[in-house]
Interface confidence: low
């Protein structure tokens, strides 16, 4: 399918001009390549009429131009002084030949309709109203006034001053006069439809002395606005219907042959195909509203219409606005899983894409709620606090520059199931929808923390261990301290080897975190997690409470108040070639200086690695040495 898009049908009248906009995908090659407009012949050949290389055919000389707008990824063909000879089939396209990527456009140029010379033309949109002005001489002031619509043979009454009204105009037509002016009467017709278009005659008086006026009423369907959007991106339909329908229910529907199927309305109706990815937002008291759809699919392409009516459904004779949506499958938005599955008590790590050109933009994660018109309250964001009800179990990790940020939610419950949106304060096309499904857990979690009821004693040493299965052996383990500004990774002390192991003892794989000495600020949520580079995996959370020492309990003298927390990894490795544990000098010994950091579970290898800090919570700084990795208060 060609990714070029433009208007399918363009109509005009002789002597007028047209402006045709064609869209192309956002690539450097497309921006610079030749653009053309050609006419299709009976043989199937397409003859160039104008191109961006400067070519202009004889028949377009002096009346056409082609302008490329690379910043919008569009080019425009303007043609003036149209004649009926211009009616035909055309292509707008890209490429060095006219067999490149293109879009078919049908142009129809009609004759100017012949109207009686004194005809007044009124041009109105469907659903709007018209007020026809009918002047008359003073002597006809007492006479009957009327408006009739011309049919083939006769003139069918619409309304007259004796209050006769044609049945198809009841409730829509009014005949009135303004103030004391006795030389003009008016007829207002509301809720205009295509059937109302035509020639009318207004008349005051009878016979040869009657005053008559010819009126041509043109009722136009709105020209569809073209919307060119990438697959998986989002689109906003901005609908402005005017004050007269401000209090009516609003809707957006999609054309389906002869009918228009409602996708969403302000009365709570919503097409299941759009569940989790649509919002309708009343904008103000002037009849303006917008509909936002995220996660665009191929099948979302089509003809859309917005409108207003008390029923929340399309109704003839009510104002509408229309769009033609094209979904470009050559999308710049990466293809990510749209469904993420978790289990109760477990966790999910959701990778949210954003425009890599906007790495400094603020990132958000919101939960789509379908009640009412639908809305998406933000749960977490960069430079923002996590909503209270998600305390200890939600964090956003921004990885600047790589076009992805990660949202982690743990301690899952079935109530977390639903739709979530990734969005930024930058490029709105990059709003994506994720459905989170949460099933009941049927087995033990992959990560388990011991002790589970964690209460640390002020001033003492406290260690928690996180057990992980062998399948996580090669992944990076981390502990982080959660705050409502994020989960800040603690420097780790990796005691384990990283080469492949011959066997793995399921029971002894653990990463420990030690607080020494415990202070009041240590109270709070901690996460144990695994990651591979910038790809985050499972997490589990534990709340560590801190209480005063009871009398008689042992006392650790905090010889170095800077030595606060350390994270050590213990792994079982069977490799007879490595038998000695290295001993390193400690430049700034802390309270652990004279003890082994961990029991020597197996043969150790490789230099210990420190995982970089992802930022400091609560204004604390952190440092690490080659062997001991301390967390300073």
């Amino acid at each position: 399918k060609s990714p070029i898009f433009g208007p399918q049908e363009v109509s005009s009248i002789e002597g007028d001009s047209v402006s045709i906009t064609c869209y192309y995908p956002d690539t450097s090659v497309n921006r610079h390549t030749r653009k053309y407009w050609c006419r299709q012949g009976a043989s199937g050949m397409c003859t160039t009429l104008i191109s961006s290389n400067g070519y202009l055919s004889k028949e377009y000389s002096g009346r056409a131009n082609l302008i490329n707008f690379p910043e919008n990824n569009t080019f425009v063909i303007n043609i003036e002084q149209l004649t009926q000879d211009d009616t035909g089939s055309y292509k707008c396209g890209l490429g060095t030949s006219n067999r490149g990527l293109s879009f078919d456009v049908s142009l129809e140029v009609s004759q100017v309709p012949e109207l009686p010379s004194d005809t007044h033309v009124y041009t109105k949109d469907i659903g709007r109203n018209v007020t026809i002005e009918c002047p008359f001489k003073r002597e006809n002031a007492p006479s009957k006034k009327s408006l009739c619509k011309k049919t083939n043979q006769s003139c069918e009454l619409v309304i007259d001053s004796t209050e006769k009204v044609n049945p198809s105009y009841i409730g829509r037509a009014k005949l009135f006069m303004k103030g004391t002016d006795l030389t003009v009467f008016y007829v207002n017709i509301s809720h205009l439809t295509h059937n109302d278009a035509g020639l009318y005659i207004c008349q005051a008086g009878e016979g040869p002395s009657a005053d008559k006026k010819n009126v041509d009423l043109q009722v136009l369907a709105p020209e569809p606005e073209l919307l060119y959007k990438d697959l998986r991106s989002s689109v906003t339909f901005e609908c402005d219907l005017g004050r007269e329908v401000a209090n009516e229910a609003k809707y957006l529907c999609r054309m389906n042959k002869e009918t228009c199927d409602v996708i969403i309305n302000t009365l709570g109706k919503r097409d299941p195909d759009f569940e989790g990815r649509i919002l309708i937002t009343p904008k103000d008291d002037n009849g303006r509203f917008s509909v936002l759809i995220t996660g665009l699919r191929k099948e979302d392409a089509g003809h859309y219409q917005c409108g207003a009516h008390s029923s929340g459904l399309p109704q003839e004779g009510w104002p509408i606005q229309t769009w033609q949506l094209f979904v470009n499958e050559e999308s710049t938005i990466p293809n990510r899983r749209s469904v993420v599955k978790g289990v109760t008590g477990g966790s999910v790590a959701i990778a949210c894409p954003y425009n890599p050109k906007e790495s400094s933009s603020l990132k958000y994660w919101c939960r789509w709620e379908g009640d009412g018109n639908g809305h998406c309250p933000v749960l977490v964001g960069t430079q923002a606090q996590v909503q209270e009800e998600y305390e200890g179990r939600l964090a956003l990790f921004d990885q600047p520059g790589n076009g992805t940020y990660t949202v982690i939610l743990n301690q899952l419950t079935t109530e977390d199931a639903g739709f979530y949106w990734c969005l930024t304060n930058g490029d709105s096309r990059w709003r994506t929808t994720i459905e989170l499904q949460v099933a009941e857990a049927t087995r033990e979690p992959n990560l388990e923390v011991t002790p589970q009821n964690a209460t640390a004693v002020l001033g003492e040493t406290f260690t928690v261990s996180c057990h992980y299965p062998c399948k996580f052996y090669s992944q990076e383990k981390y502990w982080c301290k959660w705050s409502n500004k994020g989960c800040h990774i603690l420097p780790s002390h990796d005691e384990g080897a990283r080469q492949s192991s011959v066997s793995c003892d399921q029971s002894s794989q653990l990463v420990s975190m030690t607080l020494n000495p415990v202070s009041k600020e240590d109270e709070g949520w901690y996460w144990c997690g695994v990651k591979q580079g910038q790809t985050y995996g499972e997490t589990t959370a534990i709340y560590i409470a801190v209480e005063e020492r009871t009398r008689g309990s042992s006392h650790v003298n905090p010889t170095d108040a800077n030595a606060r927390a350390k994270v050590a990894l213990e792994e079982e490795v069977v490799d007879s070639s490595i038998s000695e544990k290295e001993n390193k000098a400690i430049p700034n010994p802390g309270p652990f200086a004279n003890e082994r950091e961990i029991q020597n579970v197996g043969d150790q290898a490789q230099e210990n690695r420190a995982s970089g800090d992802a930022g400091s919570a609560d204004g604390q700084s952190r440092s690490s040495s080659s062997k001991h990795h301390h967390h300073h208060h």
């Epitope: 919002l279 103000d284 998406c376 309250p377 933000v378 964001g381 430079q383 923002a384 996590v386 949106w421």
Partner: nanobody, 123 residues
Framework: QVQLVESGGGLVQAGGSLRLSCAAS????????MGWYRQAPGKQRELVAV???????NYADSVKGRFTISRDNAKNTVSLQMNSLKPEDTAVYYC?????????????????WGKGTLVTVSS
């Protein structure tokens, strides 16, 4: 969560003026539109005025030309200057805010609400 705290309500004579203020705290990144709604005794809550982060405003017909809404994005405050007050302006005035993707009509799109401040206009 976003907290909204109103101030400036009170008793005023018809024809007088009052200035209401509202301060937002908490997850203020979530705020797009801020505004004022009111509820007179026995009546439904109705829009008074709203303002977007970009400064676009919208007023109820009944207050146009008399009330002015303004906003300080840096301080996350919104104010309502009420001049030429009438007895029918008597109501509890609520500060409200919308999330990043919410809209507003008669307040059904609002994500966050203040507790309200009473404005009484005596004749």
């Amino acid at each position: 969560q976003v907290q909204l705290v109103e101030s400036g309500g009170g008793l005023v004579q018809a024809g007088g003026s009052l200035r209401l203020s509202c301060a937002a705290s908490g997850s203020i990144f979530a705020i797009n539109g801020m505004g004022w709604y009111r509820q007179a005794p026995g009546k439904q809550r109705e829009l008074v005025a709203v303002i977007t982060r970009g400064g676009s405003t919208n007023y109820a017909d009944s207050v146009k030309g008399r009330f002015t809404i303004s906003r300080d994005n840096a301080k996350n405050t919104v104010s309502l200057q009420m001049n030429s007050l009438k007895p029918e302006d008597t109501a509890v005035y609520y500060c409200a805010a919308t999330g990043v993707l919410a809209g507003w009509a008669a307040g059904d799109g609002m994500d966050y609400w203040g507790k309200g401040t009473l404005v009484t206009v005596s004749s």
